[in-house]
């Protein structure tokens, strides 16, 4: 049967009808509406926006729209006791203080409740000491400092530039190095594109602009006080000393005007190489401490933020499926912002709103999807993916049995160059086929498909004529669905032509200057890129919810498993003596991948041939596809990261934003030459190979004929 017959609808209500209903002008209006005041998690303004969205989704025609609230740990600056950093002289006098707020953008001078820049969840404290410049504060930067340069960060305040890796990893690395405070700053090398003006005259970061953000190391736990369980009315909460992922040293972010004042006085060691130099007119000396004339001066931090259990609100909308109402396709993105949220998140929320409106229009005309579609407006994403994680914890039993797919919908744009997609390999073919049917919005590609412009601008490094699709990492609301629950997930947005700066974000990220005008004037005046992202996200949801056979191709998983096995093998073989000494074999893993490849191939053949009019067999085959992602979940989780349970993918232990393949083996091998007990370390490598091989083999067997 066709999908139209299966869902008892008229033929005109197909994907085309859904896509044609999406309008750029509506996305523009919704973005404007969502960005006029701040919507910080835990505030009245964000609660009011939740109720507005609930009301509008009901008007659009969803079957039900409910608020799901949780009481989670959030963090706010002290309104009467501001955070700042000083340079103090030998008498303890403050001879320089960093700014207390960002100069507001034009038109927003009288807006209240703009939270000043702060590092969410920083503990209180007033440490003072010598400064050490630690570059991006990556693992390799601290290796360079400690091992090569013999610089000790213990008892020092470190200053690190934003970019390359998640800020929480920077703080963790600084803590492990013994630092007593961290200053984060935006260097123009990373947040000021050459030839572009500063906001409000362009999309670059002005010197007074500052990136806010949380500095947690939650590793997928959700609310720090209720790991594994929802923060509901009867929750048992940990004491703050036992909370998950909180930093132990004060942290504060600053802009590059203030950073200049701190860095220009730096003495001590010269930067080890040019990769440690940014674009400020300072020497980028590493320290410790200030140069000759200023050697008696110190840096002092003044941090007075508080952690508070606060109510948050998700909005959950339901469009019931006509044929398989117990199969859920989820489209979710967050609503809370640091300030106005012009890009993050409201460029995504506006797209979700328009997708809901389009689906609602079809529903009012008598159409229903085959499967149930759930729409979510998550709260407190900026405070550690809290809203999505708490909801998933509350509904985990339903989700693990009924969850088909999760499509994420945070920022629709981080540039206007080309498409960027990160997803499970199961969705590669879906994304390829969909983008071949969509028109490219790019200049010079008029009349061409999105697939064509995307492939031209962002080619796959392995397969010619195909576009790059990246691994899922974390730092967004898909985390709990993919990394913890094993629900096939994907995300799509428009991005910049800036591969070297992949994880630094756009210049005005998390600053007060992320406004509606930023998007309307500089990024997407016609909202054509937003519309394209709506078509990609909405089209994926439509296909996942409406196709008779789920649009997953298990053969693509086989291809990447082989690639990932090859990669981790080559990393391991860089230690041939130890491999030999400890008899480390990859036979089990390569054998499992071989079996997976053969079984996936046979499954795909059966998928072409089976009787789709037999609902029992159809459901059986679809369940095998749905549960394949689930089969990669290890109930015990990864070592020391129990909520990262996917054996094939996890957020990198060194950068939450990046995905790592075979993370258990990778982490066991990382820096293994420095381990004090090599026998134990290589034993753990062997154990992780065993776990990976078993998991791949077990997943393969879920695709075998059932009897």
């Amino acid at each position: 049967k066709s999908s139209n017959e299966a869902t008892n609808i008229t033929p005109k209500h197909n994907m085309k009808a859904f896509l044609d209903e999406l309008k750029a002008e509506n996305i523009k209006k919704f973005l404007y509406n969502f960005t006029q005041i701040p919507h910080l998690a835990g505030t009245e303004q964000n609660f009011q926006l939740a109720k507005q969205i609930q009301s509008q989704w009901k008007e659009f025609g969803l079957d039900s729209v409910e608020l799901a609230h949780y009481d989670v740990l959030l963090s706010y600056p002290n309104k009467t006791h501001p955070n700042y950093i000083s340079i103090i002289n030998e008498d303890g006098n403050e001879i320089f203080n960093t700014s207390l707020f960002e100069p507001p953008p034009p038109g927003y001078e009288n807006v209240s409740d703009i939270v000043p820049p702060f590092s969410a969840f920083s503990p209180q404290g007033m440490p003072e000491g010598d400064l050490v410049y630690v570059n991006y504060a990556r693992t390799e930067d601290f290796f360079k400092l400690e091992r090569d340069m013999k610089i000790n960060c213990s008892g020092k305040i470190v200053i690190a530039r934003y970019g390359k890796v998640f800020r929480g990893n920077k703080v963790k690395n600084a803590q492990l190095a013994g630092a007593k405070g961290v200053i984060l700053y935006s260097d123009p090398a990373d947040y000021f594109a050459p030839g572009v003006k500063s906001y409000p005259d362009g999309w670059n970061l002005p010197g007074g602009g500052v990136q806010r953000g949380n500095i947690l190391n939650l590793n997928g736990a959700g609310d720090p006080l209720t790991p594994g369980y929802p923060a509901n009315e009867y929750a048992y909460r940990r004491g703050i000393a036992e909370a998950v992922g909180l930093p132990s040293i004060p942290v504060h972010p600053i802009g590059y005007y203030d950073a200049q004042k701190l860095l220009e006085k730096m003495g001590g060691s010269a930067p080890p190489d040019s990769s440690w130099r940014g674009s400020l007119k300072v020497p980028y000396n590493v320290g410790p401490g200030f140069t000759g004339n200023f050697s008696t001066q110190k840096v002092k931090m003044h941090i007075h933020s508080t952690n508070e259990v606060t109510r948050i609100y998700n909005v959950i909308g339901t469009l019931r499926g006509a044929v398989e109402p117990d199969r859920y396709v989820i489209l979710g993105g967050h609503r809370d912002s640091w300030v106005f949220g012009g890009i993050d998140p409201q460029s995504g929320a506006a797209v979700v709103h328009e997708i809901v409106r389009s689906f609602g229009t079809l529903k009012k005309e008598g159409w229903r999807p085959r499967r149930t579609i759930l729409f979510a407006s998550w709260d407190a994403e900026e405070f550690g993916l809290l809203g999505s994680t708490e909801w998933a914890e509350e509904n985990s039993r339903l989700l693990q049995e009924r969850g088909v797919a999760y499509i994420n919908a945070d920022s629709s744009i981080e540039g206007n160059y080309t498409l960027r997609v990160d997803c499970t390999p199961l969705m590669y073919s879906l994304v390829h086929n969909l983008t071949k049917e969509l028109k490219s919005p790019d200049e010079g590609f008029e009349g061409k498909s999105l697939y064509e412009s995307w492939t031209k601008k962002s080619p796959s490094p392995e397969f010619s004529g195909m576009p790059r699709i990246s691994k899922l990492g974390s730092g967004n609301d898909f985390e709990v669905f993919f990394q913890r629950l094993g629900i096939a997930s994907g995300r799509a947005r428009y991005t910049k032509n800036w591969e070297t700066n992949k994880f630094s974000g756009y210049p005005l990220y998390h600053s007060v200057y992320e406004t509606y005008e930023l998007v309307e004037k500089f990024y997407d005046p016609m909202f054509k890129y937003h519309l394209t992202v709506a078509q990609v996200r909405g089209g994926m949801v439509f296909e996942l919810a409406n196709s008779i056979v789920l649009p997953f191709d298990c053969r693509d998983y086989a291809v990447v498993l082989r690639k990932y096995a090859d990669k981790i093998y080559s990393i391991s073989m860089k230690h041939p003596q130890e491999m030999k000494t400890y008899s480390v074999s990859f036979d089990s893993l390569f054998s499992a991948v071989k079996n997976f490849t053969e079984i996936a191939s046979k499954f795909s053949e059966r998928l072409q041939d089976f009787d789709k009019s037999n609902p029992i067999v159809l459901r059986m085959m679809n369940d095998q596809l749905m549960f394949l992602e689930r089969a990669f979940i290890d109930p015990l989780g990864l070592p020391d990261r129990p909520f990262y349970r996917h054996v094939i993918y996890a957020p990198s232990s060194h950068n939450k934003y990046a995905g790592e393949s075979f993370p258990g083996i990778y982490d066991a091998l990382f820096d293994i030459e420095s381990k004090v007990d090599p026998s134990k370390a290589w034993g753990e490598v062997k154990r992780q190979i065993y776990v990976a091989a078993f998991t791949v083999q077990a997943a393969a067997e879920t695709l075998s004929e059932v009897a």
Epitope: A565, K567, M573, S585, F586, D587, F590, S591, V593
Partner: nanobody
Amino acid sequence: EVQLVESGGGLVQPGGSLRLSCTVSGFTFSSYAVSWVRQAPGQGLEWVSAIGAGGGTYYADSVKGRFTISRDNSKNTLYLQMNSLRAEDTAVYYCAKDGVDWGQGTLVTVSS
């Protein structure tokens, strides 16, 4: 029983080329990654290059741009094309499946 047999070693002048081969048996060659590892006189083992089951190639920094690894699955054979050879490339070159299955090695001497 897994077997790996190297050949192609010998004496070559600096700047010269050599091609090593490794014929394998006892396992489904096409489904496994394999490596070249070397041991210079009086030194420890050094990984040189690997080729994945999927055909992806990996090289040590010391040989990148000079050595090329390849495989012919139909012949169950692994190759290492070594160009622009230097004195420091002098070593016994081993074909290895992993830490367990290795060949006996073939000696490459680079000397004028």
